[in-house]
Interface confidence: medium
Amino acid sequence: TEVKVTQPEKSVSVAAGDSTILNCTVTSLLPVGPIRWYRGVGQSRLLIYSFTGEHFPRIRNVSDTTKRNNMDFSIRISNVTPEDAGTYYCVKFQRGSSEPDTEIQSGGGTEVYVLAK
């Protein structure tokens, strides 16, 4: 069966300067390939976090994704700023051998509202 990506929160509200967790789980780790978080859609979408080892300031994974069969790909964004507002998508990719990774499933999106402190 096809992998399913679930983002249970439709939206989260966070005060500027605070941190927030964006939840995402998958039903399977197959097919082999990374999970990435984006803000926005289409041409304007911005890579926020990738579970592939790179360093992303202010963002880290919530659970230990090196553990076998971990299905939780939630992230924590620290020191939130008004520029962080937008809709975040958790996206599962299938790894390509020579060609680029292929996007196969996206979560429904979580809207982040940033409140003035």
């Epitope: 679930t6 249970p8 929160e9 439709k10 939206s11 989260v12 429904g108």
Partner: antibody
Framework: EVQLVESGGGVVQPGRSLRLSCAAS????????VNWVRQAPGKGLEWVSL????????YYADSVKGRFTISRDNSKNTLYLQMNSLRAEDTAVYYC????????????WGQGTLVTVSS | ETVLTQSPGTLTLSPGERATLTCRAS??????LAWYQEKPGQAPRLLIY???SRATGIPDRFSGSGSGTEFTLTISSLQSEDFAVYYC??????????FGGGTKVEIK
């Protein structure tokens, strides 16, 4: 105070159509996702359809897909359910239900309107 | 789709007794579970969300617990107005949103 008032129910023959309305007040209608949930006589609750605040995102239960159409008019604070090709098994009380703004559970419900499909 | 199974189908108790209703999910829904009360001729009413948080205005004799696939709604001391049908609903999975089949709490 949140109010949801359904209307448009009645007795209709199989194969015919009916349009339900739900008038909303007491909250910013366009900011909330709203749903139709039904309950057949003597049965449990069954989710029917969902529409997002903007109207851009729509989902249907498999049992009504292709026959029912959900829509909303945010300028009139009204939710609609156009029901075509009605069947006896569509007989139920139809409720409109307002979702929580963060999660897909239902904070507020209307009193319901009864749809009876019978020849 | 996540299937919710409620048990028992009917619970026959006296006022003042404790009622324990169970809802089991076919797959984990974490704590994304709500409970509703429905009385004849009335709209359903939200009691519990997030598996254990009481909705506004709900008396503290109602409590929810559980996570993953097993959930419980407890009414610590039944009042006459509590005799009704209770439904659980999961909101973790994407639509279709699913309800359990209901538990009727009736007077002995």
């Amino acid at each position: 105070e949140v109010q949801l008032v359904e209307s448009g129910g009645g007795v209709v023959q199989p194969g015919r159509s009916l349009r339900l309305s739900c008038a909303a007040s007491g909250f910013t209608f366009s900011s909330y996702d709203v749903n139709w949930v039904r309950q057949a006589p003597g049965k449990g609750l069954e989710w029917v359809s969902l529409i997002s605040g903007s109207g851009e995102i729509i989902y249907y239960a498999d049992s009504v897909k292709g026959r029912f159409t959900i829509s909303r008019d945010n300028s009139k604070n009204t939710l609609y359910l156009q029901m075509n090709s009605l069947r006896a098994e569509d007989t139920a009380v139809y409720y409109c239900a307002k979702e929580n703004n963060r999660y897909r559970f239902f904070d507020d419900w209307g009193q319901g309107t009864l749809v009876t499909v019978s020849s | 789709e996540t299937v919710l199974t409620q048990s028992p189908g009917t619970l026959t108790l006296s006022p003042g007794e404790r009622a324990t209703l169970t809802c089991r999910a076919s797959q984990s829904v974490y704590t994304y579970l709500a409970w509703y009360q429905e009385k004849p001729g009335q709209a359903p009413r939200l009691l519990i969300y997030g598996a254990s948080s009481r909705a506004t205005g709900i008396p503290d004799r109602f409590s929810g617990s559980g996570s993953g696939t097993e959930f419980t709604l407890t009414i610590s001391s039944l009042q006459s107005e509590d005799f009704a049908v209770y439904y659980c609903q999961q909101y973790y999975d994407r639509p279709p949103l699913t309800f359990g089949g209901g538990t009727k709490v009736e007077i002995k």
